[in-house]
Each structure stands twice: as structure tokens, then as C-alpha cells.
């Protein structure tokens, strides 16, 4: 806590610029108007205080805000947002994307802190859904951000929101989280025609059920081992060998150097050792 | 890790010019503000320039201002200092360090390169 002291003869400061730098702790304590420092909050980012000097203009406008900051400022803070703690963040209402953006680009390129979690949190729950303009800008900033819901949290996304997911943003999701999206998925793309339809539920397919996949195989899809790796081993396992031969097309050799693991190796196991052979892999069920 | 590498300093006389270069990770780069400080023999290390992450606003020490000029390349991930009017007061090392913030104070930089001598003879 910065001590009370009178602002020495002079420098009281009419507006926020960059001689502030040059201001003590304790003389931007006395010398900033709190009321000035918010209706100039756009001026602080393009100043480069330090630090400490940041605490100092936190401390001002925590005091002019007990209740929690308004949008207008929140969406200027800049590198205070640094400073901000998930207590903070808690008594905002966030509700501009283009708030959340600035804010989160101020943690660009870093982990997601607290303070980031936090303020996602309020921005999703104040929306009441993770609509695709937002999905879209929280991906972009981490694409981790999906997987990092419970299929719970998941379950509100609305499945026009899909349409902003990238492969690279499921890298991460498990078993549980894909089972909730892949019906989602299946319904946003539902009216593609085949090959187009097969691209975009692709790195969904984790979560998709045996008669999805039958009815893939239908249609030359030509599916990789690494996504047929990681599909669900319980939809897999009812599939027959000439089902797993088309649902793979020319990729069906690559069956051989996965035969000891999940799901292939369970999926063999499962087989006639006729049909098996009738692949020409050498494979042994 | 984070790596920052110095290059262009030198020997120069008196009124001549040098540009420094400070290659940087791309994530170094794109989630930090860049900053060059100074540290002459028996002296405090001394702020210099810094340009920020957003926005792309520029601040120069006084005793630079108008001689000195900071940039930076997006695509090298590098940023530079353009220093002409150079004069024997200018000698040091040479740093360039980033911050998560846009700071003044070489407290709030995290990273620092190895340094570059710059020498400049009257």
C-alpha cells in the first residue's frame, strides 16, 4: 500500500504521457487523478512504465472501482491486465469479443494463467454458450482451449460453433471429450457431400460409434493409421476385414506395423484368421 | 529456450553509424517487447530504446532520441538498432533483452543477450 502524500508544487499531471515515467511510486500516487487514468486508459499501454509503476495505476483504479472495473476500461488495460488476480477478473462483466481479444493478447504466446482461465470463464458463462466467433478467437490464442473443457463444459457448445475447429485443437482432447463433440461435428457437416464431409469430421472421428464408421467405409474415404489409431477400440472391434480394408483403401498396409497396438491389435485378435489372410499382411489373430 | 544473439557492433569514428541486430525464437519474438540497453565501463547498465509488442509504439532514452532508431522485422524475427551521429559517449556494450511488458526498466526484462561491443573513437 503506497502511503498518502501531497503532490509536490507542479506536478500534477493534466493527462497520461510519458513523462510519468519519470514519476516516483509515490508521486504517481499523488500526482495521477484516478478519473483522468480511466478516461485515458487507451494512453497506458503506449507508455512504457514499469512494474511497479503499473501497481501504482492498479492501485488508483482499484479504489475508483471497488466494484469491479467497467468494460470501457477493462478493454484498455493493456499490460495491467498482467497485474490483475482471478479475484479481480471475478467482479468484471466482459461481454465485447473484442475486450476478450485485447486482453488475451496480452498473454500472448505464454501459458494460460489463472487470470486468462478466469476471464474466459466469465466471458463463456456471460454469453451462456461457446459461440463460434468465441470458440474461434480462444483457439486462435490456444489451441489447447477445447480440450481443456469437460465434456460437461463441452456439452454447451452448440454444434454451429464446430465450424471454428481446427484438427490441431482436438491434438489433446481424450476419449470422453471427442465423444461429445463427434455428434456435434457430424451434425454441423452434416449436409457436405462425401469426400468433403470426410475431411472436416475426420479428427472427430475419435468419438464416433461402429455404425458411423460402417457406413464410412461405404465411401472410399481412404482413411490414415493415425486416424484410424486413434478411433474408440469398441467401435473398431465389431468391424469386419473387408469394412477395415475400405474404411483404409490403400492405407490398409499400414495395418502390419500397428498389429501390436490398441485398437489394431485387439481389433486382430477379434478376427477369423481366413479373412485375415485374405489381406496379405501376415498378419496373426 | 530463449535466445537472444547480438551482432553489428564494432569499432567507428566519431559521427559515423552502425546498425545492430538482435535475432530472437519466433515465440520470443511475438509475446515479447523488445528492448536495447547499454552498459559503459564502470557504469550503471542504461536503458537505450524499446518498441512494443502491441501496438508497435517506440521509446527512446533523451540521449538518443533523434539519432538512434529501433525496428523490427516480423518475418526474421529480429529487431534492430540503427545508430548514427555516434559519438565517444555512445561506447559500451550493447543488449537487447524482451519483456512480456513495454518497460523502461531493464528489471522487467527477462532475457538478455550476450552483448555487442560498440567503440567509437574521436
Known amino acids: 500500500e503506497v502511503e498518502k502524500t501531497a503532490c509536490p508544487s507542479g506536478k500534477k499531471a493534466p493527462e497520461i504521457d510519458e513523462s510519468l515515467i519519470f514519476y516516483k511510486k509515490w508521486e504517481l500516487e499523488a500526482c495521477v487523478d484516478a478519473a483522468l487514468l480511466a478516461t485515458q486508459m487507451d494512453r497506458v499501454n503506449a507508455i512504457p512504465f514499469t512494474y511497479e509503476q503499473l501497481d501504482v495505476l492498479k492501485h488508483k483504479l482499484d479504489e475508483l472501482y471497488p466494484q469491479g472495473y467497467p468494460e470501457s476500461v477493462i478493454q484498455h488495460l493493456g499490460y495491467l491486465f498482467l497485474k490483475m488476480s482471478p479475484e479481480d477478473i471475478r467482479k468484471w462483466n466482459v461481454t465485447s469479443l473484442e475486450t476478450l481479444k485485447a486482453l488475451l493478447e496480452v498473454n500472448k504466446g505464454h501459458e494460460m494463467s489463472p487470470q486468462v482461465a478466469t476471464l474466459i470463464d466469465r466471458f463463456v458463462k456471460g454469453r451462456g454458450q461457446l459461440d463460434k466467433d468465441t470458440l474461434d478467437t480462444l483457439t486462435a490464442f490456444y489451441p489447447g482451449y477445447l480440450c481443456s473443457l469437460s465434456p460437461e463444459e463441452l456439452s454447451s457448445v452448440p454444434p454451429s460453433s464446430i465450424w471454428a475447429v481446427r484438427p490441431q485443437d482436438l491434438d489433446t482432447c481424450d476419449p470422453r471429450q471427442l465423444d461429445v463433440l463427434y455428434p456435434k461435428a457430424r451434425l454441423a457437416f452434416q449436409n457436405m457431400n462425401g469426400s468433403e464431409y470426410f475431411v472436416k469430421i475426420q479428427s472427430f472421428l475419435g468419438g464416433a460409434p461402429t455404425e458411423d464408421l460402417k457406413a464410412l467405409s461405404q465411401q472410399n474415404v481412404s482413411m490414415d493409421l493415425a486416424t484410424f489409431m486413434k478411433l474408440r477400440t469398441d467401435a473398431v472391434l465389431p468391424l469386419t476385414v473387408a469394412e477395415v480394408q475400405k474404411l483404409l483403401g490403400p492405407h490398409v498396409e499400414g495395418l502390419k506395423a500397428e498389429e501390436r497396438h490398441r485398437p489394431v491389435r485387439d481389433w486382430i485378435l477379434r478376427q477369423r484368421q481366413d479373412d485375415l489372410d485374405t489381406l496379405g499382411l501376415g498378419l496373426q489373430g | 529456450e530463449v535466445q537472444l544473439v547480438e551482432s553489428g557492433g564494432g569499432l567507428v569514428q566519431a559521427g559515423g553509424a552502425l546498425r545492430l541486430s538482435c535475432a530472437a525464437s519466433?515465440?520470443?519474438?511475438?509475446?515479447?517487447?523488445m528492448g536495447w540497453f547499454r552498459q559503459a565501463p564502470g557504469k550503471e547498465r542504461e536503458f537505450v530504446a524499446a518498441?512494443?509488442?502491441?501496438?508497435?509504439?517506440?521509446y527512446y532514452a533523451d540521449s538518443v532520441k533523434g539519432r538512434f532508431t529501433i525496428s523490427k522485422d516480423n518475418a526474421k524475427n529480429t529487431v534492430y538498432l540503427q545508430m548514427s551521429s555516434l559519438k565517444p559517449e555512445d561506447t559500451a556494450v550493447y543488449y537487447c533483452?524482451?519483456?512480456?511488458?513495454?518497460?523502461?526498466?531493464?528489471?522487467?526484462?527477462?532475457?538478455w543477450g550476450q552483448g555487442t561491443q560498440v567503440t567509437v573513437s574521436s
Open positions: 533483452a524482451s519483456s512480456r511488458i513495454y518497460s523502461h526498466s531493464a528489471r522487467d526484462y527477462d532475457y
Open positions: 519466433e515465440r520470443t519474438f511475438s509475446s515479447s517487447s
Open positions: 518498441i512494443n509488442r502491441i501496438g508497435g509504439h517506440i
